[in-house]
Amino acid sequence: FGISGRHSITVTTVASAGNIGEDGILSCTFEPDIKLSDIVIQWLKEGVLGLVHEFKEGKDELSEQDEMFRGRTAVFADQVIVGNASLRLKNVQLTDAGTYKCYIITSKGKGNANLEYKTGAFSMPEVNV
């Protein structure tokens, strides 16, 4: 499919936080497309020159992934068709904190949204009954 003459699509992200050493989720949703092969998902991080993750034609395309994310990223491939572009980030590092962009291309158009991702040693709040 060609890029020219397309409309913009709505892409929505939610700021989130990740616990160092654990797995985290960077949330992103978009207006779904009926054909998986027409969907491209790119995750980018400000200040990082390689990609965080790319998913296109129904599979991961990681040749241009930045080495700092090697082996640590995945999308929920079975949920892309319904508009879920969220990224699973394994073994969260302090250096993973920053501004991420979720960039989507479909046959309907393209769009993007930024999210702030914080990292740290967060503990679950105790609830006293």
Partner: antibody, heavy 116, light 106 residues
């Protein structure tokens, strides 16, 4: 077209420092990393490190840590590689190369000769 | 550091021959392997990236492999192909190179 042009050959004495430049043109300078690779006479290729032209952040080969410094000047789209405390085994052709996960193109190379 | 073991270190071949060069990584590097060609007195030139993707080179060059074992093949050697070839891993820094394979005229 994308081009990397390096500074000219240098002859240095042991213990001295050398600074090699690499001027980029034909692309957005801050869009890709710049790497340095060296090749001693008749030998293979040795990865020296890289610089992120956007942030100035660097990653160096462990064996050169403390002796190598990579910097950049975004106003002139130029990166620099400085190697200090030179020894005879640093005699090599030094290349800059652009990339993320593969190097293309490469500079023409700068011969640095270390000799007393 | 990841070691890249390239073989053979040199080979003699004739124009028209099929030439195969192999590279073995010391750990799994997926398909993060590149191949370069270098001629005497010149800078290396990218041939293949991501193990099998041709850069701006003739189709007689091909690359294959994933994990730890990789191959560069020249299906029909041409006079301009006599050079030294290097593999490189780009899985993690330092992006180490193989020792090189010099392809000489028989």
């Amino acid at each position: 077209q994308v081009q990397l042009v390096q500074s000219g050959a240098e002859v240095k004495k042991p213990g001295a420092s050398v600074k090699v430049s690499c001027k980029a043109s034909g692309y957005t300078f801050t869009a890709q990393y710049m790497y340095w690779v060296r090749q001693a006479p008749g030998q293979g290729l040795e990865w020296m490190g890289r610089i992120n032209p956007t942030s100035g952040n660097t990653v160096y080969a462990q064996k050169l840590q403390g002796r190598v410094t990579m910097t950049r000047d975004t106003s002139t789209s130029t990166v620099y590689m400085e190697l200090s405390s030179l020894r005879s085994e640093d005699t090599a052709v030094y290349y800059c190369a652009r990339g993320i996960n593969w190097f293309d193109p490469w500079g023409q190379g700068t011969l640095v000769t270390v000799s007393s | 550091d990841i070691q890249m073991t390239q073989s053979p270190s040199s080979l003699s071949a004739s124009v028209g021959d099929r030439v195969t060069i192999t590279c073995r990584a010391s750990q799994n590097i997926d398909t993060y392997v590149n191949w370069y060609q270098q001629k005497p007195g010149k800078a290396p030139k990218l041939l293949i990236y991501a193990a099998s993707r041709l850069h701006t080179v003739p189709s007689r060059f091909s690359g294959s492999g994933s994990g730890t074992d990789f191959t560069l093949t020249i299906s029909s050697l041409q006079p301009e192909d006599f050079a030294t070839y290097y593999c490189q891993q780009s899985y993690t820094s330092p992006f180490t190179f193989g020792g090189g394979t010099k392809v000489e005229i028989k």
